[in-house]
Amino acid sequence: LPAQVAFTPYAPEPGSTCRLREYYDQTAQMCCSKCSPGQHAKVFCTKTSDTVCDSCEDSTYTQLWNWVPECLSCGSRCSSDQVETQACTREQNRICTCRPGWYCALSKQEGCRLCAPLRKCRPGFGVARPGTETSDVVCKPCAPGTFSNTTSSTDICRPHQICNVVAIPGNASMDAVCTSTSPTRSMAPGAVHLPQPVSTRSQHTQPTPEPSTAPSTSFLLPMGPSPPAEGSTGD
């Protein structure tokens, strides 16, 4: 004979659990139906009647199968430094995440409670570790032979250009300035000679620094929202 299917509410066997999408009601001492996501228990079960569910009202939600008497309130509207990545619906809470250029300094179950602007490394310092959704930028001083002339949360230290003849040596916050070489050899007819560095860089490409015999002096600066680390600016 097939096993008899129990309809909610029913008394479970001693030691046995209720089935999926059911719960044991301590007051009724019966297995009763849960309410689906987007609903809540309007009337609780008794020994003779099952749970009565109702839809969540506006600005409230339930994400799980449940038996709560009232739906949960959606979180407050996202602040100006946040973007709403998930709207409040009857089945899910609003989720706020930090807008570009900001990171989450204090997270919550889902989304972010407090956003903070990404640290900007000042000239002479470059990004050692880029910011993420949940961590700030780490700045480091530019090592000998490299420089950064920007205040930026993304720019790394780039190698100085290599000159045939140096007009102004580079430092941590300024590129080397090359001078034209004089006089140059004669060239093939029609060729035009422009003074230029031996190697050129694109402003936007990740550099591959030349091997250097100078010892590296780079180190990571401490993280933390306040005060601004040396080599960084809160602007």
């Epitope: 209720c18 059911e22 719960y23 044991y24 009601d25 301590q26 009763c32 799980l64 449940n66 179950q109």
Partner: nanobody, 121 residues
Framework: QVQLVESGGGLVQPGGSLRLSCAVS????????IAWFRQAPGKEREGVSC????????WYADSVKGRFTISRDNAKNTVYLQMNSLKPEDTAVYYC??????????????WGQGTQVTVSS
């Protein structure tokens, strides 16, 4: 797959103490209230204690107030029940259960195999 595994039960003399642990897997404690209930042979399930997911607020049955303490460690996904001044009438199998979003009204969605607590001299 939701799993709750109780441990820490045993035989203890009246007035003694035990600490029960409930290791939770398959879901995060951030969302669920967790309850302890007990069942003695031939008796109905009795709610003992519950701790909510949102604010960590707690509920205790009158019979255990002042003697039992429930706590949770979300990082370890574990809930504890510290039982002091145990009495013979506390003898039962103790179960931990997911209590849904909150502790009231008390109910259990799923629970573990239980751990036996025996208080006897």
């Amino acid at each position: 797959q939701v799993q709750l595994v109780e441990s820490g039960g045993g035989l203890v003399q009246p007035g003694g103490s035990l600490r029960l642990s409930c290791a939770v897997s398959g879901f995060t404690l951030d969302y669920y209230a967790i309850a302890w209930f007990r069942q003695a042979p031939g008796k109905e399930r009795e709610g003992v204690s519950c701790i909510s997911s949102s604010d960590g607020s707690t509920w205790y049955a009158d019979s255990v107030k002042g003697r039992f303490t429930i706590s949770r460690d979300n990082a370890k996904n574990t809930v504890y029940l510290q039982m002091n001044s145990l009495k013979p009438e506390d003898t039962a199998v103790y179960y931990c259960a997911d209590a849904g979003y909150q502790c009231t009204p008390l109910g259990y969605g799923s629970w573990g195999q239980g751990t036996q607590v025996t208080v006897s001299s």
